[in-house]
Interface confidence: low
Amino acid sequence: YDFTNCDFEKIKAAYLSTISKDLITYMSGTKSTEFNNTVSCSNRPHCLTEIQSLTFNPTAGCASLAKEMFAMKTKAALAIWCPGYSETQINATQAMKKARKSKVTTNKCLEQVSQLQGLWRRFNRPLLKQQGSSDYKDDDDKHHHHHH
């Protein structure tokens, strides 16, 4: 799925209001420095691609994130604010339902959600350009922010 045409501001608002808190709840009891961020993203569509992959694609050692609260809210936000996203996910959802056995929070899942937090932060705040000694021109700094 190409995330280029999503309403990024609406997705950001959903992240700030609920998804971020659900991620924190999932990670409760885990030190913020316990896992190193190894996954990153360069722009908002890329961030959403990585977020979608880590949230919904089962991985070795962690096959059970899709039914977590943060995942369901992520799916809802993408379905609402990314045109045509829902249609591309029907087959994938069926596959995930078959794969899912029980809800187990493994260390691998905690690490994966830690990576997700980093990706969401990067989505929420795109990187400064490597622009040398210039005026402040960070693209994302001019938009209107949303309250928590």
Partner: antibody
Amino acid sequence: EVQLVQSGAEVKKPGASVKVSCKASGYTFTDDYMNWVRQAPGQRLEWMGIISPYNGGTSYNQKFKGRVTLTVDKSASTAYMELSSLRSEDTAVYYCAREDYDYDGYAMDYWGQGTTVTVSS
Amino acid sequence: EIVLTQSPATLSLSPGERATLSCRASSSVSYMHWYQQKPGQAPRPWIYATSNLASGVPARFSGSGSGTSYTLTISRLEPEDFAVYYCQQSDSGREFGGGTKVEIK
């Protein structure tokens, strides 16, 4: 616990350069931005510039353009601020300040203890 | 460049009184942050994003405003509240106001 520990006080001659370090701990260094702010004796806070430790992207206050250089050493979780062509009015306390963007509006939530730079002939 | 002007420069009040600190921006900003600074110390974040109190900040503090006009209010001054308060915006660069010193009358 998030901590920013800065290098010690410096005394420099006019025309020289100074490089101040800021060692970060207690969080993932590349996740947040680092600002540099200075305060001359009895004066207001003055923003100098900002750097993204993730990719080295920088932006500077125009007032310091060409004189200030911000860099990072990711492996050491350390940010650096170098100010060149020093003059007496650069005498100030220099702070590094982490900028957390989990908050709306991007606030500076943790500050270093400050490094006093004295420029005197 | 967005210029922030704080007023008054000095506010002389007694403990128990109400303090109202103003910060005006030369052009509209999305949010305002406030920091408290005491002599010989680094600034401490006090209010985030106009109205959100930083961790450990007493409920007698509040922040409000929008556009070009923002206010920090202390409902009843306590001895530990006497300090300098700076406003700061993040819309264009990172600029601070000149500060308001809240001193004991």
